[in-house]
């Protein structure tokens, strides 16, 4: 069943077929007997009861009132009574845009990340059974969509979707065609959950080292899910039995990004692995971010500053 | 609209340097990183290199180490693959596009080296 | 480098018949910390750029139909067009992302029987 019409405030559109609808329908089925009645007000006139001798274009069934359409006159407040029960409504009818398929104040927005799933669903379940057909338009140009009843779009968004998309539904009422149109501004945006990322720490790091010790090289940045880290060095990696890449370490942060970390253990270090670069590249769909890492003997280590140490 | 516009065609001779632009509009440009590949006439498709538009950072490809520049200008959304010491084997269709799956292409610019 | 080998390097089909191209990385392009394949297909036309299809092994593009799909994973991997149309007809090439230089397969090339 067609929910009530809770909202206080509802702005329509001239020519449309328009309902409201009291939100204690299923009370007033079972106090059958109870007298229901609904009333307009409007500038100078106080609670005029409707019903419908009031006007041709008005429809009165167990729980609404409708419009067959709603034209500019029709704006004013509207109030439901029944025994205790009040209910009001404050009506705008606004004009039709004659030089468009839709009106603009009535457009609902909604922003969708490209690649990211999108979906319009042409439906008016109220006039369902009434509906001959329906169209769907993309800036006032016909969609050629399979079904004609329920037109839908479903697919992962891509920039070029972007814009108003217009649901127009034909329906025949008392021999009379109308059309109820309901439009979307879809605005299509880059994926907002994505960051650059970040190597953490300083970008050029010497390390003090002895010749026939071990010693561990840390790279840590905050990446995205799909975001890559990993070690390069020498001419292909690898070559070197001495030098090792750990499992790379992740944890999920709370903005749902990531901080990873990966071990580069170089055993026994030769005169080999001195003054030579160590790379760790972090890559992404943005480019990459590089940090090196250059061991040094001890013994030569007054020759740099002490800035420029990692320990 | 999404897309990648790049400069005209050029004919060089052998030594020469080529310039090609390539413009982006209808995203945010520092998003991806634009990667340039080439197509000799009637082969597969070369892997040239890549800059990082958010921190200009480059990685080309080994056999074109020293002879190809990678630039972007952030202030007109545009990146820029330079090429010199231009030999007849750089004939090519020369193509910019964006992010490391390449979803998004320019038409291409047909570079002829010929004396 | 990683080395892309594409198989085979042409393909007759019939139309309406199933087209099965593969592609073979010489190192693994699976990135065991997200479990994700750095690898994508490509179709290019005569005269036109390159058109993505595929990304992550078996993500389709959008806009992409449904009769193209991806799989496989770490070095193994497979485009299948599930019935073959005619405006298919293509060089189809594969390409990994996984460490630079990004590396494309040698291209195949689909016709029809």
């Known amino acids: 069943a067609e929910s009530c019409t809770s909202r206080p405030h509802i702005t329509v559109v001239e020519g449309e077929p328009f309902y409201l609808k009291h939100c204690s329908c299923s009370l007033a089925h079972e106090i059958e007997t109870t007298t229901k009645s609904w009333y307009k007000s409007s500038g100078s006139q106080e609670h005029v009861e409707l019903n419908p001798r009031s006007s041709s274009r008005i429809a009165l069934h167990d729980c609404v009132l409708e419009f067959w359409p709603v034209e500019l006159n029709d704006t004013g407040s509207y109030f439901f009574q029944m025994k205790n029960y009040t209910q009001k409504w404050k009506l705008n009818v606004i004009r039709r845009n004659k030089h468009s398929c839709f009106t603009e104040r009535q457009v609902t927005s909604k922003i969708v990340e490209v690649k990211k799933f999108f979906q319009i669903t042409c439906e008016n379940s109220y006039y369902q059974t009434l509906v001959n057909s329906t169209s769907l338009y993309k800036n006032c140009k016909k969609l050629l969509l399979e079904n004609n009843k329920n037109p839908t779009i479903k697919k992962n968004a891509e920039f070029e979707d972007q814009g108003y998309y217009s649901c127009v539904h034909f329906l025949h009422h008392n021999g009379k065609l109308f059309n109820i149109t309901k439009t979307f501004n879809i605005t299509i945006v880059e994926d907002r959950s994505n960051i650059v990322p970040v190597l953490l720490g300083p970008k050029l790091n010497h390390v003090a080292v002895e010749l026939g010790k071990n010693v561990r090289l840390n790279c840590s940045a905050l990446l995205n899910e799909e975001d890559v880290i990993y070690w390069m060095f020498g001419e292909e990696n690898g070559s070197d039995p001495n030098i090792h890449e750990e499992k790379e370490m992740r944890i999920m942060t709370p903005e749902g990004k990531w901080h990873a970390s990966k071990v580069l253990r170089i055993e026994n270090i030769g005169e080999s692995n001195l003054n030579v670069l160590y790379n760790c590249t972090v890559a992404s769909t943005g480019g990459t971010d590089t940090k090196s890492f250059i061991l040094v003997r001890k013994a030569d280590m007054a020759d740099i500053p002490g800035h420029v140490f990692t320990r | 609209q999404v897309q990648l516009v790049q400069s005209g065609a050029e004919v060089k001779k052998p030594g020469a340097s080529v310039k090609v632009s390539c413009k982006a509009s209808g995203y945010t440009f520092s998003s991806y990183g634009i990667s340039w590949v080439r197509q000799a006439p009637g082969q597969g498709l070369e892997w040239m290199g890549w800059?990082?538009?958010?921190?200009?950072?480059?990685n080309y490809a080994q056999k074109l180490q020293g002879r190809v520049t990678m630039t972007t200008d952030t202030s007109t959304s545009t990146a820029y693959m330079e090429l010199r010491s231009l030999r007849s084997d750089d004939t090519a269709v020369y193509y910019c596009?964006?992010?490391?799956?390449?979803?998004?292409w320019g038409r291409g610019t047909l570079v002829t080296v010929s004396s | 480098d990683i080395v892309m080998t594409q198989s085979p390097d042409s393909l007759a089909v019939s139309l309406g018949e199933r087209a099965t191209i593969n592609c073979k990385s010489s190192?693994?392009?699976?990135?065991?910390?997200?479990?994700?394949?750095?690898l994508a297909w490509y179709q290019q036309k005569p005269g036109q750029p390159p058109k993505l299809l595929i990304y992550w092994s078996s993500t389709r593009e959008s806009g992409v139909p449904d009769r193209f799909s991806g799989s496989g994973s770490g070095t193994d991997f497979t485009l299948t067009i599930s019935s073959l149309q005619a405006e298919d007809v293509a060089v189809y090439y594969c390409q990994q992302y996984y460490r630079t230089p990004y590396t494309f397969g040698q291209g195949t090339k689909l016709e029809i029987k």
């Open positions: 190192q693994t392009v699976l990135y065991s910390s997200n479990n994700k394949n750095y």
């Open positions: 596009t964006r992010g490391w799956y390449f979803d998004l």
């Open positions: 800059i990082s538009v958010y921190n200009g950072n480059t």
